[in-house]
Amino acid sequence: SIPWNLERIIPAWHQTEEDRSPDGSSQVEVYLLDTSIQGAHREIEGRVTITDFNSVPEEDGTRFHRQASKCDSHGTHLAGVVSGRDAGVAKGTSLHSLRVLNCQGKGTVSGTLIGLEFIRKSQLIQPSGPLVVLLPLAGGYSRILNAACRHLARTGVVLVAAAGNFRDDACLYSPASAPEVITVGATNAQDQPVTLGTLGTNFGRCVDLFAPGKDIIGASSDCSTCFMSQSGTSQAAAHVAGIVARMLSREPTLTLAELRQRLIHFSTKDVINMAWFPEDQQVLTPNLVATLPPSTHETGGQLLCRTVWSAHSGPTRTATATARCAPEEELLSCSSFSRSGRRRGDWIEAIGGQQVCKALNAFGGEGVYAVARCCLVPRANCSIHNTPAARAGLETHVHCHQKDHVLTGCSFHWEVEDLSVRRQPALRSRRQPGQCVGHQAASVYASCCHAPGLECKIKEHGISGPSEQVTVACEAGWTLTGCNVLPGASLTLGAYSVDNLCVARVHDTARADRTSGEATVAAAICCRSRPSAKASWVQ
Amino acid sequence: QDEDGDYEELMLALPSQEDGLADEAAHVATATFRRCSKEAWRLPGTYIVVLMEETQRLQIEQTAHRLQTRAARRGYVIKVLHIFYDLFPGFLVKMSSDLLGLALKLPHVEYIEEDSFVFAQ
């Protein structure tokens, strides 16, 4: 029978299928930076090249040297999960092992950097097919380790990292916190976050998605035919590295941005019980469990988007938060969220030639998040149109005035500090299709894009009675690109996108003093790409 | 994901006291020193010196050599363990933490990070 983890990540229609590149050979190479490995195990024999790379600190004590098989345990198991004959995700994939962890599973940032540099050198000396680097390790936040991952990713290498097993915010660890890395948390057979003793999987905005990481059966280094089960975010990352290897075997030209977007888009949604995570992390943590996506040929030119949260701005009066998309992605909208509701809105600005999403804290606020909607829009030409705040009592309108440009998102930013004197912005699709509409003291920003066949529409949902949140979803075939909250009067916490759902949040205390006439409205901008069609606004 | 997390950054912007030697013109450090927030994971005595992105190959070697020379003048021996050329410009050194102020004032230095442990997950 198929082990639960493989059943979970490989849909039935993929089970028997062998992934091969168009020319018939599987050219993907996976580099594993881990302990030494037992290359003679039946699961991985003939698939693994054990490089002579070795950069590890000395072990504490000597007991490990006696039983060398224990030194190989972690790496052998992961190699088996990636490409094992029986229990592997990407059964045909060739794997190169670099030893950066000692017999006790400890390594150093410097050793890992030298390992990453070794891969880069190998790539320069002998260019090959697609490369996937598996980093089943974690240390404290390291600017240089993250920078090295960024540099390697920009050469076309796909890096997959363990989120960490500290039951903590993955952003506090490296390489998990590197944006250019696909960071993987761990779930169990019930699709719940993995608990490991008193700790467990890391979580938060730096995690891209989760994958099986509890009681995973794989190669044991103790004998050539032994299997053992291991748990952790390393195992989860190995599953995703295997999925990525299979995706690249079929379609070697997929970029990191495309791989990440497809992994997110085709993952299993909303099965994780978010109550396991700390309350302040629940909104930031993706409710996604990895599955092997179909090929792009089977799914057509879908518009793919993901939500990127910024770090928390901090509570100072002028604190700003910044969310960035990957270089290949288009920032189609920007919104903001504050748990206290004290925020001065959000806007898009260009920094160093890249559009970024900014959010501003308000006086007395505990801080804000900027929430970027990052999408893959082939041949897109996007621009931002903004209008300064209107005089008191007047509305501010911004629309996309360039021919064939469609509105993909709206942002609003208030100049005034005093939240009580202003009414919040509104986005009116019925009266003014394709326009962002703001109220007193709000600067309004419209994100306008032109791309072949891109069409968009606004979808609103309002609730008059007391409600902590209002949601509106884009229907099948449409992708959420923009999400805003349009309140009647009271304080809103902001809005953000969860997959294809626009969530508008209202302050708890605001519920009681809201009259039935003051509906809180969640407004979504839904877009789709129809390559044959002209860019258009759908009424 | 790119903001610095729970991370120690120390500005060691000490005014130069470089004995007035010709190649050690007054230079105030703008580079920063960083280390892991978890003390037990730190590896004091080993440092990754990260240079500005556009630093040329020869300049990396010169900077490492300059640090060795300046350290030697002060009676310290430092060991350059590795030079990074391909992913980023920099070098790995084993040296006394006493020399961090000196290292941060070297030209081309963007920041210095103390080495730290990583763990199998």
Partner: antibody
């Protein structure tokens, strides 16, 4: 397929030595260690010693003085030698590596 | 040296029953424990490796669990072919076998 084949049964005189050869196939002795275990009549399994993949050895303290394990990697053979056998050393001797075991060698110590 | 105390030393059960055998180590063995089935005239057969991993070809009625010093092995829905002697072995530090449990059918 992994196999460990042991040399045939032997009758050993008291105070004499015992030699058993374990020939492995399906894996390399440079990759995995080989353990030796015995079962005396009516008793349980007893670990005797091991030769690790690198060639180093560890022995059960009770047998240390009279046991020697060596190997020839190129021939995929492990050699087990025990000296000064007594009647209570009568047992089935196995070479093993966790999942894969030899068929056993029956050793009888008798005058 | 690590000692392994296995209990019971013998066990009689009916077909279809669930039986459990325990092994206690003299110190923490970090889950490095195997469980073997041994039948007369044959070499021991590895059932479970590293505390709980069922080896390929072994029926799912066999299971293992534990951590630290305490480990257990169970057979649910006992079948006639399960008559054998069962051993635990720690391999955290070299190998040490438990005394064995002889399983008989009532």
């Amino acid at each position: 397929q992994v196999q460990l084949k042991q040399s045939g049964p032997s009758l050993v005189q008291p105070s004499q030595s015992l030699s058993i050869t374990c020939t492995v196939s399906g894996f390399s002795l440079t990759s995995y260690g080989v353990h030796w275990v015995r079962q005396s009549p009516g008793k349980g399994l007893e670990w005797l010693g091991v030769i690790w993949r690198g060639g180093s050895t560890d022995y059960n303290a009770a047998f240390m003085s009279r046991l020697s394990i060596t190997k020839d990697n190129s021939k995929s053979q492990v050699f087990f030698k025990m000296n000064s056998l007594q009647a209570d050393d009568t047992a089935i001797y196995y070479c093993a590596n966790h999942r894969d075991w030899g068929q056993g060698t029956l050793v009888t110590v008798s005058a | 040296d690590i000692q392994m105390t296995q209990s019971p030393s013998s066990l009689s059960a009916s077909l279809g029953d669930k039986v459990t055998i325990t092994c206690k180590a003299s110190q923490d063995i970090n889950k490095y424990i195997d469980w073997y089935q041994h039948k007369p005239g044959k070499g021991p057969r590895l059932l479970i490796h590293y505390t709980s991993t069922l080896q390929p070809g072994i029926p799912s009625r066999f299971s293992g669990s534990g951590s630290g010093r305490d480990y257990s092995f169970s057979i649910s829905n006992l079948e006639p072919e399960d008559i054998a002697t069962y051993y635990c072995v720690q391999y955290d530090d070299l190998w040490t076998f438990g005394g064995g449990t002889k399983l008989e059918i009532k």
